[in-house]
């Protein structure tokens, strides 16, 4: 009933709650003396379904048979229409259409932790569209039955608030859920389990790790667990890895030795627990413990390379370079590098510790046989030293690799290729490909890069420290015992026309010809490896095409003679530079008039 219904009644048969597809009879009847004031025969009763008229009848009552009602609630309202007045609401009724509950499926119960409470979940099946009450029952030992009702509209979970205790862990419990509404009831199949089946332990806590004698090989993981835990799973991984190592342990009693950890590595550790070998479920994983393993002495050997530079008749400069050990080889924080320089015949030795960088430069006599040894040290010890005999790396011409070429290979890569030396190629023990940014001054502070290649290789892809639009001086060394031969080439990974031309800084007259001097183009404006310079000249105020002279680019060259100028004629001169991608714009213009006699 939806209002006071003073004027009449609406009755619904067989019930206000019906099964989907059922028919209902709705009767609207006026109470005595509640019809139209003068003309009771003119009473017009109208039945509305929500706001839509579905039936009407003249008289004191109206009967209507209604079919095809949808799931859910439908509102019917009966109104009275009298002549010359608005319709008056008589009464109304709501009809609830639904279905009986389906049998609840997949009932399962769990207790989180030995101190937790039992909660069960199930699948309700299709919506009944009616108020449906769920009652969960749990029968256990000691002739007790627990029961709880769910008042939620969509109920598929109930927590009993009961903590099962392990007095008899093998005792059986039986759970059952029953759904009841106005159209029927249905019970799930019973679910039978023991304490051990449904208790899911809490995850382990208070996880710690200890390294005995600060050694990675003597490592024990400790944790705390609930009292009944029998099994543990451990998983651990380096913090930068996605793959876990897994270990299963039985009766660990809160400790386990780990034997395969890598030194000086941050690991993440997690543990899970279970009460029984084949019953019950694993706990969630514990919170992660992150810990760094102790250092061990370095393994592996440093990759060492060197450069020799002539200073004067008695002295030479040696620059040593080495690469960092990989993390797995360093096995700790490298505190310093130890460099030992020794004259092999006289036995004189000098040792120095280098911190903070991976190069060392010294000056030694040009006489004598020199060797160096370089090792890396952490808090636990040193790597095996890498020994190198200092020799003239390019002295053996017959060992020089042939037909060296350098070609761009995608973004910031250069493919270097060569042919074996003329001398017996089988004598080559290894090739070293070295590259550094080309600096016109031959600056020794420019970082040096190198890679080693096996003797049967005739190419190498260089990608480390390669920048676009920079020219690199590339050398390929063939090493054989105490001899070496080398070839060099210039190369870039990407190039375009230079951004500017050379700046002419002086023009001088010498015996009827001129010498033009210029400043090198700044490295950042060269845009790759320069191939040529061009010198242009033409008579001042002339419209004729300029003449030009093309000079192959050489790193150290910054002057060039021209002897085809006429005396006492004023010329305008300028220069450009070329890479494989094209020619630069003009450099500055200079005027010059040769003073020499006319022919």
């Amino acid at each position: 009933k939806i209002d006071a219904c003073k004027r009449g009644d609406v009755t619904v048969k067989p019930s206000h709650v019906i099964l989907l597809g059922s028919t209902v009879n709705i009767t609207c009847s006026l109470k005595p003396r509640q019809g139209c004031f003068h003309y009771s025969r003119r009473n017009k009763l109208i039945l509305y379904k929500f706001d839509r008229r579905i039936n009407f009848h003249h008289g004191h009552s109206l009967n209507s048979q209604v079919t095809g009602l949808p799931l859910g609630t439908t509102l019917f309202v009966c109104k009275l229409a009298c002549i010359n007045s608005d319709e008056i609401q008589i009464c109304g009724a709501e009809i609830f259409v639904g279905v009986a509950p389906e049998q609840p499926q997949n009932l399962s119960c769990i207790q989180k932790g030995e101190q937790g409470t039992v909660a069960c979940t199930w699948e309700r099946g299709r919506d009944t569209h009616l108020y449906t009450e769920y009652t969960l029952q749990l029968s256990g030992p000691k002739n007790l039955t627990w029961q709880k009702q769910c008042k939620d509209i969509y109920c598929d979970y109930l927590d009993f608030g009961i903590n099962l205790t392990p007095e008899s862990p093998e005792s059986n419990f039986t759970a059952k859920v029953t759904a009841v509404n106005s159209l029927g009831s249905s019970s799930s199949l019973p679910s039978t389990f023991t304490f051990l089946d449904i208790v899911r332990p809490l995850p382990p806590w208070d996880i710690r790790i200890k390294f005995q004698k600060a050694s990675v090989s003597r490592c024990t993981l400790y944790w705390r667990d609930e009292g009944l835990v029998l099994l543990n799973r451990l998983r651990y991984r380096p913090s930068n890895s996605r793959l876990w190592n897994m270990v299963n342990v039985t009766k660990a009693k809160g400790r386990h030795d780990l034997l395969d950890l890598k030194p000086f590595t941050e690991y993440e550790f997690q543990i899970s627990s279970k009460l029984h070998l084949y019953k019950g479920s694993w706990s969630d994983w514990s919170e992660s413990l992150r810990a760094q393993t102790p250092e061990e002495e370095p393994t592996g050997m440093l990759d060492v390379w060197y450069m020799k530079r002539h200073i004067d008749y008695s002295r030479q400069q040696i620059s040593l370079f080495w690469k960092n050990l990989s993390v797995s080889e360093a096995r700790g924080k490298i505190l310093h590098y130890q460099v030992t320089l020794q004259e092999l015949t006289g036995g004189k030795a000098m040792t120095q510790n280098i911190t903070g960088h991976t190069s060392w430069t010294t000056v030694i006599p040009r006489t004598g046989n020199w060797a160096v040894a370089v090792s890396a040290a952490n808090s636990k010890g040193s790597s095996l030293p890498t020994r190198i005999n200092i020799m003239n790396l390019c002295e053996a011409g017959l060992l020089a690799p042939r037909q060296v070429s350098a070609n761009s290979e995608g973004m910031d890569n250069i493919l270097v290729t060569w042919q074996p030396p003329r001398k017996d190629p089988s004598a080559v023990q290894e090739y070293v490909v070295e590259w550094r940014e080309l600096h016109p001054g031959g600056d020794t502070q420019v970082p040096l890069n190198w890679l080693r290649s096996r003797p049967y290789n005739v190419s190498a892809l260089i990608s480390e420290n390669i920048k676009s639009y920079i020219c690199y001086e590339i050398r390929v060394y063939a090493l054989s015992g105490d001899q070496g031969g080398c070839s060099s080439i210039l190369g870039n990974s990407k190039h375009k026309a230079p951004l500017s031309g050379p700046h002419i800084n002086a023009i001088t007259e010498e015996k009827g010809s001129i010498l033009i001097s210029w400043n090198s183009i700044p490295v950042q404006e060269q845009m790759g490896c320069l191939l040529h310079y061009r010198i242009y000249w033409k008579e001042r105020d002339s419209n004729s095409q300029p003449q030009l002279c093309e000079i192959p680019y050489r790193v150290s060259q910054n002057s060039h003679p021209i002897n085809s100028l006429q005396p006492r004629v004023t010329y305008v001169l300028w220069m450009t530079a070329l890479t494989a991608a094209g020619e630069s714009s003009h450099g500055n213009e200079r005027e010059f008039c040769l003073q020499g006699k006319a022919n």
Epitope: W146, G161, I162, N163
Partner: nanobody, 127 residues
Framework: QVQLQESGGGLVQAGGSLRLSCAAS????????MGWFRQTPGKEREFVAA???????VYANSVKDRFTISRDNAKNTFYLQMHSLKLEDTAVYYC?????????????????????WGQGTQVTVSS
């Protein structure tokens, strides 16, 4: 002073129904477990039913599906509705209150876990 007072007992024919009430005073029992026990001469008190503070009902299997326990926290009163009574249900029925809402499964059925007791009300089922 805490008091529990039972009422509603009496003589009833087998198959009949009775509703026992337990009115509490002196403290609020809405957060406590409340239980009904019964005792016949010469025997120990036997657990009948309990209702926890989370409204979980607990029944002895002998009365399951026949008895229903409920509570009205606003009135601080607890009820035991008994249907289909049998001759063996004849006993003095006691209302008992817990100090707090324990959740351990072992405490509901043990009289020693209930510090508060009523005086009892006699239920007699005749043939």
């Amino acid at each position: 002073q805490v008091q529990l007072q039972e009422s509603g007992g009496g003589l009833v024919q087998a198959g009949g129904s009775l509703r026992l009430s337990c009115a509490a005073s002196g403290r609020t029992f809405s957060k406590s477990t409340m239980g009904w026990f019964r005792q016949t001469p010469g025997k120990e008190r036997e657990f009948v039913a309990a209702i926890t503070w989370t409204d979980t009902e607990v029944y002895a299997n002998s009365v399951k599906d026949r008895f229903t326990i409920s509570r009205d926290n606003a009135k601080n009163t607890f009820y035991l509705q008994m249907h289909s009574l049998k001759l063996e249900d004849t006993a003095v029925y006691y209302c008992a209150g817990d100090r707090y809402g324990s959740s351990r499964d072992s405490v509901f059925s043990s009289p020693t876990n209930y510090p508060y007791w009523g005086q009892g009300t006699q239920v007699t089922v005749s043939s």
